[in-house]
Amino acid sequence: SIPWNLERITPPRYRADEYQPPDGGSLVEVYLLDTSIQSDHREIEGRVMVTDFENVPEEDGTRFHRQASKCDSHGTHLAGVVSGRDAGVAKGASMRSLRVLNCQGKGTVSGTLIGLEFIRKSQLVQPVGPLVVLLPLAGGYSRVLNAACQRLARAGVVLVTAAGNFRDDACLYSPASAPEVITVGATNAQDQPVTLGTLGTNFGRCVDLFAPGEDIIGASSDCSTCFVSQSGTSQAAAHVAGIAAMMLSAEPELTLAELRQRLIHFSAKDVINEAWFPEDQRVLTPNLVAALPPSTHGAGWQLFCRTVWSAHSGPTRMATAVARCAPDEELLSCSSFSRSGKRRGERMEAQGGKLVCRAHNAFGGEGVYAIARCCLLPQANCSVHTAPPAEASMGTRVHCHQQGHVLTGCSSHWEVEDLGTHKPPVLRPRGQPNQCVGHREASIHASCCHAPGLECKVKEHGIPAPQEQVTVACEEGWTLTGCSALPGTSHVLGAYAVDNTCVVRSRDVSTTGSTSEGAVTAVAICCRSRHLAQASQELQGSTSGSGLNDIFEAQKIEWHEHHHHHH
Amino acid sequence: QEDEDGDYEELVLALRSEEDGLAEAPEHGTTATFHRCAKDPWRLPGTYVVVLKEETHLSQSERTARRLQAQAARRGYLTKILHVFHGLLPGFLVKMSGDLLELALKLPHVDYIEEDSSVFAQ
């Protein structure tokens, strides 16, 4: 059978007897910044070009005695995971290696920066197809390393990095904390977070997704036909770099934002046991395990959205938290969440010519998170319509009045310290879906968008008795763009999107009592794009042989057939 | 020995090219900041990445590096420019005493300075 990790990332319909396209990733070049590598290993021979770049710290001034095979161990294994003949993810990808880690696997921020600069200069001198840069390393939070990653990403390069093996918040490490980088945590064969002793995979809002990272069999630098098992978030990141190479080879024009959204979309959802993560990190950590798409055809019509959490605001009364979307994503809605329930809502506001989501802490609150729903919506024209707090007891309401604009999200923000002491609003009359309704003490913000073929609908799920969690999901073919709660009273901790489900969290029922005040409604706004679907159908009609699907169908490879002769 | 000669040579060049005196003060109202790794054992004091403002050209980066060397030399400090960045970020990598940070933060075009630190295979 194929190794567990390759089986795990293979789409279900191919698991029975097929594995990988023989030339998957062939249009893509993957740069590996790591230790030296054994480039004549059978797994990677002819696939990896060792550049002349080397910038590593000395091993503390004494000669390093571990033989070359250990110096090459980490990098060789990762090169094999990305593109190895037998045990690689993207068997057709070509790689270039830069040595930025010494024989102990140690490097410097400055050496990594110079390596990234080297890649940028190489790209300028000789532009090739899509580039993926794999950074299977981590250091403490570094503003400069994150900035360099941002610049390289904005130059069209896809950067994939290890979340880190410190069983800690990935946001405390770099390049894991750089928003433009795809940050990967590690899971094992049971889809559980990888543990080793007191350490293990990092987690938190800076992780984009998880991938196999425990007991991964790959090229060993012991000898040119040796294999060995290694574990870590580096191995997980190598899987995602391989998947990215496959996707980019099938669709070379994909932008970083499109690639990230696809990686998230095709991941296995909700399979990780969240109990492993610290309680305060569970809601922030994506429950996603990377997988290859079953086909790239049919993906284009989808309206892709992801949830972006802000950093924690901190506890001061006027503290705010800001969540931002990537440059080519649209902010379609904004919500907020506070563990203490003390918050003053959220609003969408313009910052540097782009909409951001800002959440407001309240007096006595422990702090808030802003949660942005970031979507890929080509040719979109979005604006925010605001209604100030209403005088009438009916509550505040605002709708999308411009022709052709549809409602994609509702936010509410209030100045009063505790909405719970004020009468809640009457719920929205039926038949008026294109408007946001909120507490009369709150200002309401509607996100209104015009995009070709965009249609949206509101879906509500109300529970009369108090409950800690109320959810409502969009059905197949529709994508969740907005998630909010009605009413905005103080026992509601906030609302956030998890994949295609809107989650509204309330304070523990034992503290709220079971009065009508406890009633909570989760409001989801579900959208789809007929334009994208149409464009995709046209593309399918006129294209053949370029999708992953076609490559998969083209040649079936059983892993062990190619592997057994090494034994 | 080679290294010392290299340092001396660089220093002489920097002093010679320093025609415009001590300081072009940084742009009004902006203060450059200093950053270092929060994890103490991973810090590498003595090596610093000086990051310049976004639109700084390579020639300005080189001039700023030379200016730092000249000003440091006047105070009796040796510095070594290890790398001048361009292409991704404008700036330079410098080996110098931490005593010079205050001086370096006041140089023109400086956005922030970060002390070098370790990264590790994961």
């Epitope: 250990k70 870590g232 034994h567 | -």
Partner: antibody, heavy 121, light 107 residues
Framework: QVQLVQSGAEVKKPGASVKVSCKAS????????IHWVRQAPGQGLEWMGY????????KFNQKFKDRVTMTRDTSISTAYMELSRLRSDDTAVYYC??????????????WGQGTTVTVSS | DIVMTQSPSSLSASVGDRVTITCKAS??????VAWYQQKPGKSPKLLIY???NRYTGVPSRFSGSGSGTDFTLTISSLQPEDFATYFC?????????FGGGTKVEIK
């Protein structure tokens, strides 16, 4: 669960050879190097060498280089260590151990129960 | 070969005591050091890897520290099941070498 089970005790005469086996279970045998370590009575631990079961690659302590052979049979997930030209000071408990690689760390996480080899005339 | 000098070779202590065992490498081994516990007639058991990382399932009273040439294993509060022999091992350079061992006995 992951375990290494070694063959039983051996009594050998000086000049003879001994072959100790180490059967792995609970994990992919070819994915981890198997190291051999010995311990003379009342003494410390001494590393002898290792084999990478995915190939026939071996690395030995120079001290044993001319007398030790390490092999494996992947069909039965078993590694073997043969020591020839035995001397009385080869009397020891011989252990096999699995080496694990995590990040850039190496360590022996699983050990066999040990095989006592007595060399006596 | 790198020599790992472990001290003391034996020590007597009581339940609840704090015990410290040291290992000195003849040259820099960075953090490539592991510590093992061995009970009579049993095989060694991994406690600490990479100088300071506690292995899965090892009680928190065991901790390791050091880098370069000087390493320490500390048992913060000795328990009855901790009476055993402890070995350090360097994995920085072949051949891997072990310390001579420290026997922790009941006082």
């Amino acid at each position: 669960q992951v375990q290494l089970v070694q063959s039983g005790a051996e009594v050998k005469k000086p000049g003879a050879s001994v072959k100790v086996s180490c059967k792995a279970s609970g994990y992919t045998f070819t994915g981890y190097t198997i190291h051999w370590v010995r311990q003379a009575p009342g003494q410390g631990l001494e590393w002898m060498g290792y084999i990478n079961p995915s190939s026939t690659y071996t690395k030995f302590n120079q001290k044993f280089k001319d007398r030790v052979t390490m092999t494996r049979d992947t069909s039965i997930s078993t590694a073997y260590m043969e020591l020839s030209r035995l001397r009385s000071d080869d009397t020891a408990v011989y252990y096999c151990a699995r080496e694990r690689i995590y990040s850039n760390y190496w360590f022996f996480d699983v050990w066999g129960q040990g095989t006592t080899v007595t060399v006596s005339s | 070969d790198i020599v790992m000098t472990q001290s003391p070779s034996s020590l007597s202590a009581s339940v609840g005591d704090r015990v410290t065992i040291t290992c000195k490498a003849s040259q820099n081994v960075y953090t490539a050091v592991a510590w093992y516990q061995q009970k009579p007639g049993k095989s060694p058991k991994l406690l600490i890897y990479s100088a300071s990382n506690r292995y899965t399932g090892v009680p928190s009273r065991f901790s390791g520290s050091g880098s370069g040439t000087d390493f320490t294993l500390t048992i913060s509060s000795l328990q009855p099941e901790d009476f055993a022999t402890y070995f350090c091992q360097q994995l920085s350079s072949y051949p891997d070498t072990f310390g001579g061992g420290t026997k922790v006995e009941i006082k």
